[in-house]
């Protein structure tokens, strides 16, 4: 690595992955093992993210860049660059301090994290329940039979029940 | 998930009777009236009456007399009777509440 | 019986453009309930046509937002804001007002 001559900051022309060397007359030197410098001009290289116990690591660290963290399986992500694993629960339940519960009637959790929520309202919208909620699953809303067709009261009253292939009386 | 699903013979020979059965999942034929269409190949839907949710029913009037509609809402059936099959009977026939259709079932009307 | 005219026949777009399909009934399609009964369809090679519009222009569960319907009486209209090629296929017009009930002839959107 050659010897800064910036007449402003020497420092500024050491690009990331090294760091200005004051104990070497700011010459830029690459950054020691597991550390890491994401920009030009740093004076010092940041350590490392270490992916420990629940934590597995998803992008190993390079001079460049930090380590990216993600959870071992039945384990989530929280927080920014995933600060936090949380333990995952079955689709139809939420995390409590008490561990996983199944989701109260009426509400429902699509995912393995997060809480139940409530099944949507269809009234609130002048439709009707298609399809029932489950634990699982939110309610499918559609039109209701009014909004399909006006219905048998509609049309004349239909013929007698009959077999086909007698006319109708 | 809704579903309707049509089961019929696939092949009938001319002058022959017709029955399909529709099969539906996840609602109620006592809520929704359900209707049966027709498509030539080739060519556009044709109604061909409908059993209302009550469980009354109407016919197309060019099939009025050979046709016959009627379910069973406790085994979530619905069955379609037409007689005296002609070769232009040949279509695909489709039950749906309008708002779901079932995949059709193929009736080929021939010697 | 209604008649059902749909006009064009075939509508030739490119992606991304913005079509319009336009649906004729020989009477009026308001029910004396006040209700107008009038659907539209896509039917794509091979399969059983899924409904887009239902009572003239309320949004089908899962029909994406691109899809419009507007109109009364007996002139209705279908507009894709813009066209994707999954939209690609027959457009039929249904009503279900009076028995029996009819259906248009069908408009086939196809690539320009």
């Known amino acids: 690595f050659e010897r800064t001559r910036s007449l402003q900051d020497p420092c500024s022309n050491c690009p990331a992955g090294t760091f200005c060397d004051n104990n070497r007359n700011q010459i830029c030197s690459p950054c020691p093992p597991n550390s890491f410098s994401s920009a030009g001009g740093q004076r010092t290289c940041d350590i490392c993210r270490q992916c420990k116990g629940v934590f597995r690591t998803r992008k190993e660290c390079s001079s460049t860049s930090n380590a990216e963290c993600d959870c071992t399986p039945g384990f989530h992500c929280l927080g920014a660059g995933c600060s936090m694993c949380e333990q995952d629960c079955k689709q139809g339940q939420e995390l409590t301090k008490k561990g996983c519960k199944d989701c109260c009637f009426g509400t429902f959790n699509d995912q393995k994290r997060g809480i139940c929520r409530p099944w949507t309202n269809c009234s609130l919208d002048g439709k009707s329940v298609l399809v029932n909620g489950t634990k699982e699953r939110d309610v499918v809303c559609g039109p209701s039979p009014a909004d399909l067709s006006p219905g048998a009261s509609s049309v004349t009253p239909p013929a007698p029940a009959r077999e086909p292939g007698h006319s109708p009386q | 998930q809704v579903q309707l699903k049509e089961s019929g013979p696939g092949l009938v020979a001319p002058s022959q009777s017709l029955s399909i059965t529709c099969t539906v999942s996840d609602f109620s034929l006592t809520s929704y009236d359900l209707s049966w269409i027709r498509q030539p190949p080739g060519k556009g839907l044709e109604w061909l009456g409908v059993?209302?949710?009550?469980?009354?029913?109407n016919y197309n009037s060019a099939f009025m007399s050979r046709l016959s509609i009627s379910k069973d809402s406790s085994k979530s059936q619905v069955f379609l009777k037409m007689n005296s099959l002609q070769t232009d009977d040949t279509a695909i026939y489709y039950c749906t509440t309008v708002h779901y259709w079932g995949q059709g079932t193929t009736l080929t009307v021939s010697s | 019986d209604v008649v059902m005219t749909q006009t064009p026949l075939s509508l030739p777009v490119s992606l991304g453009d913005q079509a319009s399909i336009s649906c004729r009934s020989s009477q009026s399609l308001v029910h004396s309930n006040g209700n107008t009964y009038l659907h539209w369809y896509l039917q794509k090679p091979g399969q059983s046509p899924k409904l887009l519009i239902y009572?003239?222009?309320n949004r089908f569960s899962g029909v994406p937002d691109r899809f419009s319907g507007s109109g009364s009486g007996t002139d209705f209209t279908l507009k894709i804001s813009r066209v994707e090629a999954e939209d690609l296929g027959v457009y039929f017009c249904s009503q279900s007002t009076h028995v029996p009930w009819t259906f248009g002839g069908g408009t086939k959107l196809e690539i320009k």
């Open positions: 059993i209302w949710a009550g469980g009354g029913t």
């Open positions: 009572k003239v222009s």
